[in-house]
Interface confidence: low
């Protein structure tokens, strides 16, 4: 879009005559009609394709035309066009005589034409005026002309539209060549795209104004780079939204089941070694000198009957001391100075010579033991308690102290694992020899029926435009993570496109 400007400077009609040769009465009250059109090798009649303009009466016969542009007048004459300037043109300037005040074509006498000039040629857009003078037999017209671009139009052909704006359709000013120059914080072809907070995640974050970072569903954090785990997730993390990936030692749908009681609770005391043996279940292996489920009980060192051959044990601060009976010596009274001749075997034990009488061995009757049959048999030495139960001598009998989850004389029976209702989501529990088994209802799986399997809200591919679908397990619904340029619960709506500009 631009304007062809024509500045009329001087018109000479010394004899004051019309084109027909007839004189004007009393003089030629002259006005001009201008026709601007496309280039024609021979300027011929037809539409003034680039526009027409008429002047008022500017003078009589011969006169100079004042430059009225400063006063808002009509010289230079303006012929606006709203297309790409082609660089060539045809121009027709007619001088007419107006006998009265009505300058409309149909109101003029048929022979009111004074003169007509027609020129054609090339004309580039620019600020400089081209001066021209056309002379006919009776008249002379001096004028100048140029083509300039309208406001907001740029380029060699005034074809580049650029109007600064700061609204929904763009945020820019115009460079001298008509190219857009985005305002700070904006980018894109039409400067419509805000530049988000530095570091804002490309897919998971977006912004509607500069230096902002708004998170898409399922994401959080200043830069929208932290996923939101499943609602209720206790000891777990996520790599995509609504996940609950359990930390080590935790299990279950919400990672709230403790699979590493040893690490999380350190139940074993006095330096014992802890072994996990199931959910909230563990075994402590005690260091010498300690006993109890959690090795919390300190044993007297003499409780293990370290003194042999009837030696008596005395606890000391730094350990114990064996007082040996006659005929025996050594740390544990293990060395004998006796032979069968000394009747060393007690409780009816039979003595057998060894090493040519230098040594002996006692064969003990039932229920007695020891190198001299001096000890009643400890019913716990055969470790009769199953499943890690602790054996305790109680006078003539023995008893087993069972670990949690076991019962029976020898801790051989499982307390029903099912008593705790371990099966989630209505699963049916079955006790087995070495644990339990859950039979899960439709839609659930896993050792404890903790995994949902039936309802996958994403199975039907509800998200459009290549969005990522996430199943929200807490509500059996889906969430669509839209790619850039789309919005809506299913990413079905494109964000508003820039308007089509004419270039």
């Amino acid at each position: 879009s631009g304007v062809f400007q024509l500045q009329l400077q001087e018109f000479i009609n010394e004899r004051g005559v019309l084109a027909s040769g007839r004189p004007c009465e009393p003089g030629c009250r002259t006005f001009f009609r201008v026709c601007l059109k496309h280039f024609q090798a021979v300027v011929s009649p037809g539409p003034c394709t680039f526009g027409t303009v008429s002047t008022p009466v500017l003078g009589t016969n011969s006169f100079a035309v004042r430059d009225d542009s400063s006063g808002g007048g009509r010289n230079p004459l303006q012929l606006p066009f709203n297309f790409t300037w082609p660089g060539t043109f045809s121009l027709i300037i007619e001088a007419w005589h107006a006998p009265g005040d009505d300058l409309r074509p149909e109101a003029l006498p048929p022979d009111a034409l004074i003169s007509k000039i027609a020129i054609q040629g090339s004309l580039a857009v620019g600020q400089n005026w081209l001066l021209d003078e056309q002379t006919s037999t009776l008249t002379r017209l001096r004028y100048s002309y140029r083509v300039i671009c309208s406001d907001n139009y740029y380029g060699d052909n005034c074809s580049r539209l650029c109007k600064k704006r700061n609204d929904h359709f763009g945020h820019y000013v115009c460079q001298p060549d008509g190219n857009l120059s985005c305002l700070p914080g904006w980018t894109g072809e039409y400067c419509q795209q805000p530049i988000c907070l530095s570091g804002c995640h490309e897919q998971n974050g977006y912004c509607s104004k500069p230096a902002e970072c708004l998170c898409r569903p399922g994401w959080q954090g200043r830069l929208c780079n932290e996923c939101i785990p499943h609602n209720g997730c206790r000891h777990g993390t996520c790599s995509t939204p609504w996940q609950c990936t359990c930390d080590e030692g935790w299990g279950g749908l919400f990672c709230d089941q403790d699979l590493n009681y040893c690490t999380h609770h350190s139940p074993c005391k006095n330096g014992a070694t802890c072994s996990n043996s199931g959910q909230r279940s563990y075994t402590c292996t005690c260091r010498p000198g300690y006993t109890g489920v959690d090795c919390e009980l300190e044993l007297s060192e003499c409780d293990s009957n370290p003194c042999r051959n009837g030696g008596s044990c005395k606890d000391q601060e730094d350990g114990y001391h064996c007082l040996c009976p006659p005929g025996y010596y050594g740390l544990h009274c293990e060395h004998s100075t006796l032979s069968c001749a000394d009747s060393p075997c007690f409780n009816g034990g039979s003595c057998r010579e060894r090493n040519q009488g230098a040594n002996y061995a006692c064969e003990c009757p039932p229920n007695f033991t020891g190198s001299n049959c001096e000890k009643k048999v400890d019913r716990c030495t055969s470790n009769p308690c199953a499943n890690g139960g602790q054996c305790l001598n109680r006078g003539p009998s023995r008893m087993c102290r069972c670990r949690p989850g076991f019962t029976g004389t020898y801790c051989e029976l499982h307390v029903s694992d099912c008593a705790r209702n371990p099966c989630a989501h209505g699963g049916t529990c079955h006790d087995l020899e070495n644990g339990l088994m859950c039979t899960c209802p439709a839609g659930f799986s896993g050792r404890r029926c903790e995994v949902r399997t039936s309802i996958d809200a994403c199975a039907s591919s509800p998200c459009f435009n290549r969005a990522t679908c996430y199943t929200d397990l807490s509500t059996d619904t889906f969430v669509c993570n839209c790619p850039y340029g789309f919005v809506g619960s299913r990413c079905e709506f494109p964000v508003g496109l820039p308007p089509s500009f004419p270039w």
Partner: antibody, heavy 119, light 108 residues
């Protein structure tokens, strides 16, 4: 007043030519142009072309380009339209009309010339 | 070529009624270059409106024109007996200059 008077009706055989005249009066002939328009029986108006009386430049509609010639004679202020190789579908009333250089509507019109093409 | 389509083809009205005639162009026409003509039976056309809305000399003010772009309208506010005729629109902005096919206004 401004007036255009056309020549009388013509009957022609297919393949012949016809030349219709249009005599102008009441205005300076050379500062305007003449357009030619035809109207077949019961039909609408069809523009054929124009000629400038100022410099004899002419522009013809595509349909008639090969068969029509328009001329003017400023000494008699008369415009002419010649149509060659006549066919039966050229049967029509042919009108001349004045148009201004800047303002291209047609005013006034001649009274029309009926050309009948028949074997 | 710009095609002008006039509607309706025929308009049956009584004297004193208002007539609205439409002319639609196949592409945009500058309003500077649209005219309306009236043709009585057996007569040459007569210029009514030029420049889409300017009345020609001697045309009564019951005739008015309006429109721009591709849609133009000729309105006769109160029909007189002499207004029953065929009306043509014409564009003279793009060569070839073309006419609409005409609207006949007849007495009901």
């Amino acid at each position: 007043q401004v007036q255009l008077v056309q020549s009388g009706a013509e009957v022609k055989k297919p393949g012949a030519s016809v030349k219709v005249s249009c005599k102008a009066s009441g205005y300076t002939f050379s500062t305007y142009g003449i357009s030619w328009v035809r109207q077949a029986p019961g039909q609408g108006l069809e523009w054929m072309g124009w000629i400038s009386a100022y410099d004899n430049n002419a522009d013809y509609a595509q349909n008639f380009q090969a068969r029509v010639t328009m001329t003017t004679d400023t000494s008699t202020t008369t415009a002419y339209m010649e149509l060659r190789s006549l066919r039966s579908d050229d049967t029509a009333v042919y009108y001349c009309a004045r148009y201004s250089w800047n303002f291209h509507w047609f005013d006034p019109w001649g009274q029309g010339t009926l050309v009948t093409v028949s074997s | 070529e710009i095609v002008l389509t006039q509607s309706p083809g025929t308009l049956s009205l009584s004297p004193g009624e208002r007539a609205t005639l439409s002319c639609r162009a196949s592409q945009s026409v500058s309003s500077t270059y649209l005219a309306w003509y009236q043709q009585q039976p057996g007569q040459a056309p007569r210029l009514l409106i030029y420049g889409a809305s300017s009345r020609a000399t001697g045309i009564p003010d019951r005739f008015s024109g309006s429109g721009s772009g591709t849609d133009f309208t000729l309105t006769i506010s109160r029909l007189e007996p002499e207004d029953f005729a065929v009306y043509y629109c014409q564009q003279y902005g793009n060569s070839p200059w073309t006419f609409g096919q005409g609207t006949k206004v007849e007495i009901k």
